[in-house]
Amino acid sequence: PPNRRTCVFFEAPGVRGSTKTLGELLDTGTELPRAIRCLYSRCCFGIWNLTQDRAQVEMQGCRDSDEPGCESLHCDPSPRAHPSPGSTLFTCSCGTDFCNANYSHLPPPGSPGTPGSQGPQAAPGESIWMAL
């Protein structure tokens, strides 16, 4: 379809780099959540940092191209990296408007399918790009 994809846009304070230029930020009349209209893909993404007690959103926005996973209707995150011991980054890609606003579910830390606690470690910030 010719219409462009619109996604939720968010970047946590301290995250290095930005995906802001992958789309056009929209004025939706409310402070949050922000919306971004994708330029180069029809695909949204989300990254969450899962620790023992909570999941915290790190980034949400547009992908720079359509890739496997972008055909998903919903955000179903999968584990990608370990920014620090006891936390795991989960990412999703999906291809409907605002599909990255929230995830459908996250597996509990340490459950099957989550990389073991001895998995690859990354410096803060770097891990976001590993996840993308």
Partner: antibody, heavy 117, light 111 residues
């Protein structure tokens, strides 16, 4: 200062392939934004042909999709247009332009391409 | 694709007068209330020059006598007081849907 410059043959024979180069200075084509080809027909109408983004993703005007190819050489900071099976209707001034988001903020001076035998 | 119709085709005015140019889209060019319509000026032998983006935002370096307004399908470019250098052809462009499309242009000529 961002500058774009088109180059290529000014005369192309019908049924052949039109090939143009856009050389960009003052900005890396891999840094950001998208790099477009736009043409202007003798009647002054403008047509967006397609782009290649900083990351290499490509989008074409559906009216040209079967004939157009846009590519790039990042080492030379150049991007290219190929348009196959040209006819007299492809005679136009061809511009390369940068799109900052979805509008065109920097343009080349344009090059006239005439399709004639 | 979205068709943009500009009117009038030619506008004959004198320096100092107000110019009002219209661009009508075959369907809405808004996304969640944001208008993806842009305006360019073109002089003979030159490429188009960006004046206004997203309906009403003035491009850096463009004089404040140029302004844009409108939403959904109807947009206007206004030149509050025509200067001699403003006599040119003006084009609208939409980017709400692929492919990007341009209007046919309005020529502003000296009366």
């Amino acid at each position: 200062q961002v500058q774009l410059q088109e180059s290529g043959p000014g005369l192309v024979k019908p049924s052949e392939t039109l090939s143009l180069t856009c050389t960009v200075s003052g900005y890396s084509i891999t840094s950001d934004y998208a790099w477009n080809w736009i043409r202007q027909f003798p009647g002054k109408g403008l047509e967006w042909m397609g782009y290649i983004s900083y990351s290499g993703s490509i989008s074409y005007n559906p009216s040209l999709k079967s004939r157009i190819t846009i590519s790039r050489d990042t080492s030379k900071n150049q991007f290219f247009l190929k348009l196959s099976s040209v006819t007299a209707a492809d005679t136009a001034v061809y511009y390369c332009a940068r799109s900052r988001y979805s509008w065109f903020d920097y343009w080349g001076q344009g090059t006239l391409v005439t399709v004639s035998s | 694709e979205i068709v943009l119709t500009q009117s009038p085709g030619t506008l004959s005015l004198s320096p100092g007068e107000r110019a009002t140019l219209s661009c009508s889209a075959s369907e809405s060019v808004d996304t969640y209330g944001n208008s993806f319509m842009h305006w360019y000026q073109q002089k003979p032998g030159q490429p188009p020059r960006l004046l206004i983006y997203r309906a009403s935002s003035l491009e850096s370096g463009i004089p404040v006598r140029f302004s844009g307004s409108g939403s959904r399908t109807d947009f206007t470019l206004t030149i509050s007081r025509l200067e001699p250098e403003d006599f040119a052809v003006y084009y609208c462009q939409q980017s709400n849907e692929d492919p990007y499309t341009f209007g046919g242009g309005t020529k502003v000529e000296i009366k």
